[in-house]
Interface confidence: medium
């Protein structure tokens, strides 16, 4: 019996659903009674699902898992993995037996995008050419490890003087710190790359120093001139300090964070105390940072909703304020690709293939090319519908003429997360099984 | 198009300087970094350094530090090259060459047609 | 520096054969980039970031490699592939070219 699985890993965010996919052909008269499915881990042999005695099992894999059961008569043998953990990645074998029997393993690799770096400085106040500075470049709750890599304002790498480091939490998602240790000059800027290898993911910033006395009088609040990138559902921290002077207390700072548009308060610090979220619950300060004159903001569950500017104001004597921008983004998923009409195909048709992609955000980017990777932009019409969650489904219809046969791609990109999904089809113009 | 295009062959004496543009087309000169790298008649490619036009800042290979000098017409959308103190071994063809978009890309996506310079007394 | 040395400096191949050449770093490089050069004209971005392939290049070229070993290959030469190649690397400065492999007709 031939089972056939993807040859290529499948990879799956961590908290979205994967289908490992897996099928076989079922002969005439076949009936799922005479069906034994077996999804097992390859290495283990730790049951996952099964299927027998014409019934499903059930899920044996911490009831994350489900078949197809509408197409096991049809050969269609995939398991759904559910809420994707980085424990989940490994290999996972396929068991069908009929008559014959047959298995084949399909690989599951797990990825997780690494947030906007933040870039902290030590000493951050009073620098002049020549002192050593520490620059430390840190990017949250990505997988897997993550590369990382410095340059300076003319594009030059820098490879001396950096230690990284990449701390797994209980999830199994990496935090990277990466630490540069530079001479200043007169002024220079310094760049930070961390790199998923696996989504080919780049998240980059910069910070530009410029030694010189800051002038006495404002407070001066310092935020990230770039906006902070929030995947759907994960949380943000919107950076923001000030520079506390020798004796400082808490009980002299005033601290609030709003909405820049609306001014509606967000989260506030006041009398030597914090008083809370005044935004839905789901925001928090670090108080243990405060006196060092951390005044960020952490904001949970990130909603499309949430997406704008944020103002963090700080009173101590003097005041001092500075916003800084949320951007909301969620990937798209790979494209799922379908004909209209789907058989019977003759060079000479019209055919419409539809692109379609799921619960993305913001609005996506799409293009189509030809086999030769010529772009197709006439006939193509895209519509996308934010559903109540505000992300938003894509779907785009091309309309063409066959030839004697041809390749169709569909991508869907990201502008945000420049994360592309792409799917394409082949028609050959002969009747199609 | 983007386009490359430099300045016509030079002949110099040994301890003359020489100065070769590189004038870029069909793309915004500013965001993007460009370098210079040398090719002696029959041998390898070498890099001799490169300039950000947005704010003029450079990087020399050390090989050529106090020699070369590179500089910016963003006005005109041109990048230059000046080698001073000539010898005979700088006979090469001098490219100029664009470092790749991305603030990360470490290679040349887009290059110059060459300026051949001859050093001969 | 990081040298970096190409095999084999050249090589005698027949229209659609399969090509392979090897670039061995001095010392790790995060990166390798392959450029093909034809007599009298510029360098030409081959493959960028080690297994990248270059806008309008043909998908008969692929690279591979990791650390200090990074390999190019034509899958099927063609007569218009007959040309130097060229690896580089800026992993560290500076910026670094392999002496080149020539590939000519047999």
């Known amino acids: 019996l031939e089972v056939q699985v993807p040859e290529d890993p499948v990879v799956a965010l961590v908290g979205t659903d994967a289908t490992l996919c897996c099928s076989f052909s079922p002969e005439p008269g076949f009936s799922l009674a005479q069906l034994n499915l077996i999804w097992q881990l390859t290495d283990t042999k730790q049951l996952v699902h099964s299927f027998a005695e014409g019934q499903d099992q059930g899920s044996a894999y911490a009831n994350r898992t489900a078949l197809f059961p509408d197409l096991l008569a049809q050969g269609n043998a995939s398991l759904r993995l559910q809420r994707v953990r980085v424990a989940d990645e490994g290999s996972f074998t396929c068991f069908v037996s009929i008559r014959d029997f047959g298995s084949a393993a399909v690989s599951l690799q797990v990825a997780a995008p690494y947030s906007k770096p933040s870039m902290t400085l030590e000493p951050n106040k009073d620098l002049r050419p020549g002192d050593t500075v520490t620059i430390t470049c840190s990017s949250y709750q990505g997988y897997p490890e993550a590369e990382v890599f410095w340059q300076d304002g003319q594009g030059v790498p820098l490879t001396g003087n950096v230690t990284t480091s990449q701390m797994a939490n209980e999830q199994g998602l990496f935090d990277v710190h990466s630490i540069l240790r530079v001479v200043l000059g007169a002024n220079g800027t310094y760049s930070c790359l961390v790199r998923n290898p696996v989504l080919q993911q780049d998240a980059h910033s910069s910070v530009t120093i410029t030694p010189q006395r800051s002038p006495t009088g404002a407070v001066e609040v310092q935020v990230p001139e770039d906006p902070v990138v929030a995947l759907v559902g994960t949380d943000a921290t919107l950076r923001c300090s000030f520079s506390p002077e020798p004796g400082f207390s808490l009980a002299q700072l005033n601290l609030i964070w709003q909405l820049t548009d609306t001014k509606q308060l967000v989260h506030s610090f006041t009398e030597g105390r914090d008083q809370g979220s005044a935004y839905a619950n789901r925001t928090a300060l670090f108080p243990d940072l405060l006196a060092q004159g951390n005044a960020s903001l952490r904001l949970q569950r990130v909603r499309v909703a949430d997406e704008g500017s944020f103002t963090c104001f700080v009173s101590i004597r003097d005041f001092g304020s500075a916003a800084v921008s949320l951007q909301v983004a969620a990937p798209y998923s790979k494209p799922s690709m379908t004909l209209e009409p789907n058989k019977d195909l003759r060079p000479g048709d019209t055919v419409t293939i539809t692109c379609s992609s799921y619960r993305g955000y913001p609005e996506a980017e799409v293009f189509w090319q030809d086999g030769q990777g010529v772009p197709l932009t006439g006939n193509v019409t895209t519509s996308q519908m934010a559903n109540e969650q505000g992300l938003f489904d894509v779907h785009s219809v091309l309309r063409v003429v066959l030839g004697a046969n041809g390749t169709y791609s569909c991508l869907v990109r990201n502008p945000v997360l420049q994360q592309d999904a792409h799917g394409s089809v082949t028609i050959t113009g002969q009747p199609m099984t | 198009e983007v386009q490359l295009v430099q300045s016509g062959a030079e002949v110099k004496k040994p301890g003359a300087s020489v100065k070769v543009s590189c004038k870029a087309s069909?793309?915004?000169?500013?965001?993007?970094?460009m370098h210079w790298v040398r090719q002696a008649p029959g041998q390898g490619l070498e890099w001799m350094g490169g300039?950000?036009?947005?704010?003029?800042?450079?990087t020399y290979n050390q090989k050529f530090k106090g020699r070369v000098t590179m500089t910016r017409d963003t006005s005109i959308s041109t990048a230059y090259m000046e080698l001073s103190r000539l010898r005979s071994e700088d006979t090469a063809v001098y490219y100029c060459a664009r470092k790749g978009k991305d603030y990360f890309d470490w290679y040349f996506d887009v290059w110059g047609q060459g300026t051949t310079v001859t050093v001969s007394s | 520096d990081i040298q970096l040395t190409q095999s084999p400096s050249s090589l005698s191949a027949s229209v659609g054969d399969r090509v392979t050449m090897t670039c061995s770093a001095s010392?790790?490089?995060?990166?390798m980039h392959w450029y093909q050069q034809k007599p009298g004209k510029a360098p030409k971005l081959l493959i960028y970031d080690t297994s990248k392939l270059a806008s309008g290049v043909p998908s008969r070229f692929s690279g591979s490699g990791s650390g200090t070993d990074f390999t190019l290959t034509i899958s099927s030469l063609q007569p218009e592939d007959f040309a130097t190649y060229y690896c580089?690397?800026?992993?560290?400065?500076?910026?670094?070219f392999g002496g080149g492999t020539k590939v000519e007709i047999k």
């Open positions: 010392s790790s490089v995060s990166y």
């Open positions: 300039i950000n036009p947005n704010q003029g800042g450079t």
């Open positions: 069909g793309y915004t000169f500013t965001e993007y970094i």
């Open positions: 580089q690397q800026w992993s560290a400065s500076p910026l670094t």
